[in-house]
Interface confidence: medium
């Protein structure tokens, strides 16, 4: 059902004239940024952004592609080259080091230069690189980390940790030799490397002693604490600050975020990663949008500003499973969080960036009709006379043979939240992809986000915009509304 007005050239000419008018009026905000927010869509390549845009539009009963995402409204866009020092196609650890610390590293290592070697503990010391979040804290700003994965996962860990192995979530995940050499697990680094004001996400089991029952799943032993050192890291973190509060469910989060006596907040809502949005129990677990709002409420109290990292971390997991439904519903929630943050902050004093760490081998093609379900079938049949979907994967668990042939697929099947899109090559997990990803920017110094850049440039833009090390002599006028 094509809108009749789109058949008229005037429609497109008028729309373009409006866009041109807005572009001509666009003025860079030349002051420093008081606040920094980086939204990280894990695995959110450009094909994912496009497909999520259509899904979000269709959820609003529109045709889809014409309906802008919140991130589409950001005036400045660049491309980010995501390769790591040792791989054409990177992982979330090496990329986090780049966009959060400003230095590219090696595959599976976090917060370390490429002089460090994966899994070799003795290559850690002396190769640490400092995150923008750490520098923001040193400058007197409040800082926060929000994610739908474990808070000890690769992307958020890039903000606070230094490790040669991204999988060292707790000491139980580390070899004895690494522990003896003095390497620390990521959960320990979360509470000891720096003072983080807000920590929201999953990852309870890495904080408590082995066998400690989980408050939400007390009879499920697989969700018990994992720590071999017997420590209660939550208790240790609470003891550091008088105004610290720990919560593990949505109700407690909402109460804590409105309590003026709470200065530090840790919310861990699942033993491991948080639930996919389609599986989330809205009475028990907060959404990414709600966590973002809670974080902003607390962090905004600091007159010197804040740094906030927000990750839609399970977009990546949905893709790894070849389940586009999961990936795209996560991406839509991620965009909802961006929209909410825009309502709660001002672009006059807040630099907001939206980017991805890497892409996925996720494709969107096959000439589907406008307005047809994003999860639907291509209009024609393939050479094997069977239907195929517009969304597909280059590799992954979606490769299936039925009687030696590619299985047929129906519209009903392909629209199911559990459907795995077909793949060309069989793998246990679908892989990341190596093409450039988008960086969207809004706010003070957002105009610096332009062209094709190394991923490590992102951290430098944030540091410069807020006059953080090594750009303390940034020579920028103070942020709007400040007097010093």
């Amino acid at each position: 059902i094509i809108p009749v007005e789109e058949e008229n050239p005037d429609f497109w000419n008028r729309q373009a004239a409006e866009a041109l008018g807005a572009a001509k009026k666009l003025q860079p905000i030349q002051t420093a940024a008081k606040n920094l927010i980086i939204f990280l869509g894990d695995g959110m390549g450009v094909s994912t952004v496009t497909a999520a845009r259509i899904l979000k539009g269709q959820k609003e009963d529109k045709l889809g592609p014409e309906t802008p995402l919140a991130m589409d409204h950001f005036p400045y866009v660049a491309l980010s080259k995501t390769y790591s020092v040792d791989k054409h196609v990177p992982d979330s650890a090496a990329t986090a080091t780049a966009y959060l610390c400003g230095v590219k590293g090696n595959f599976q290592t976090i917060g370390l230069s490429a002089a460090a070697r994966y899994n070799q503990c003795n290559t850690t010391r002396g190769n640490e690189v400092v995150s923008v979040m750490n520098r923001a804290k040193k400058a007197g700003k409040s800082v926060g980390v929000v994610t739908t994965t474990r808070v000890q996962h690769a992307s958020p860990a890039g903000a606070y940790a230094h490790t040669v192995n991204r999988n060292w979530y707790s000491d139980a995940n580390m070899p004895g030799s690494a522990r003896r050499e003095g390497c620390k697990d990521i959960a320990t680094q979360l509470i000891s490397n720096m003072d983080i004001d807000v920590i929201l996400g999953g990852g309870r089991k890495y904080m408590f002693r082995m066998g400690a029952p989980d408050p939400e799943y007390p009879h499920d032993y697989s969700q018990d604490g994992t720590r071999m050192d017997g420590k209660n890291l939550v208790q240790e973190w609470l003891a550091k600050q008088q105004g610290a509060r720990y919560v593990w469910n949505r109700t407690e989060l909402m109460q804590a975020s409105l309590d003026p006596s709470v200065t530090h907040l840790m919310g861990l809502f699942e033993p491991g990663d948080m639930k996919y949005e389609i599986h989330r129990d809205p009475t028990l677990d907060p959404s990414l949008m709600e966590m973002t709002e809670a974080a902003l409420r607390l962090l905004s109290r600091n007159p010197r500003g804040f740094f906030l990292f927000v990750e839609g971390g399970r977009i990546d997991h949905g893709h790894h499973e070849s389940r586009a439904y999961r990936a795209l519903t996560e991406a839509v929630m991620f965009d909802d969080a961006i929209e909410r943050a825009g309502q709660l902050t001002s672009e006059e004093d807040t630099l907001t960036l939206v980017t991805a760490d890497h892409s996925h081998v996720f494709s969107f093609g096959a000439y589907p009709l406008r307005g047809s379900s994003i999860f639907g079938l291509a209009p024609g049949k393939a050479q094997d006379r069977k239907a195929y979907t517009a969304l597909l994967y280059g590799n992954g668990p979606g490769y299936v043979l039925k009687d030696g042939a590619r299985p047929d697929v129906t519209e009903s099947e392909s629209g199911s939240p559990e459907y795995r899109q077909q793949a060309a090559v069989p793998l246990d997990e679908e892989t990341h992809a190596g093409e450039d990803v988008a960086v969207f920017a809004r706010g003070p110094q957002a105009h610096l986000v332009h062209g094709v850049q190394e991923q490590s440039f992102i951290a430098h833009v944030m540091a410069f915009a807020a006059c953080l090390e090594p750009y303390t002599a940034c020579d920028l006028a103070p942020p709007a509304g400040t007097t010093d």
């Epitope: 799943y217 699942e270 639930k275 996919y276 599986h279 129990d281 997991h317 559990e418």
Partner: nanobody
Framework: QVQLVESGGGLVQPGGSLRLSCAAS????????MGWYRQAPGKQRDLVAV???????HYADSVKGRFTISRDNAKNTVYLQMNSLKPEDTAVYYC???????????????WGQGTKVTVSS
Amino acid sequence: QVQLVESGGGLVQPGGSLRLSCAASGSIFSVNTMGWYRQAPGKQRDLVAVATSGGTIHYADSVKGRFTISRDNAKNTVYLQMNSLKPEDTAVYYCNLVVPYGMIAGDHDYWGQGTKVTVSS
């Protein structure tokens, strides 16, 4: 070990109704997708309806407006209310449980034994 027990199948006249239920027992993580698939004689197994623990519901086009899926999370049970039944709804109906364990590509898939539904005058 997880077990799925279906009930409610039987013989019904065209235009009639049936209610299928499927109870899951064993070690079940609270995050899951429960649903119904059916297999007509000589055909492949097709999706009928699924419902996730977060409230997402999806129906096959052929049953939309006639069938309603619902679940009782406390009882780990999923129901399928089938109204305005047609002869082409005749099939063995299978209950399905998908449990995502938070590990990438690590979902556990469980199936019931099936319950026969015959729509005939």
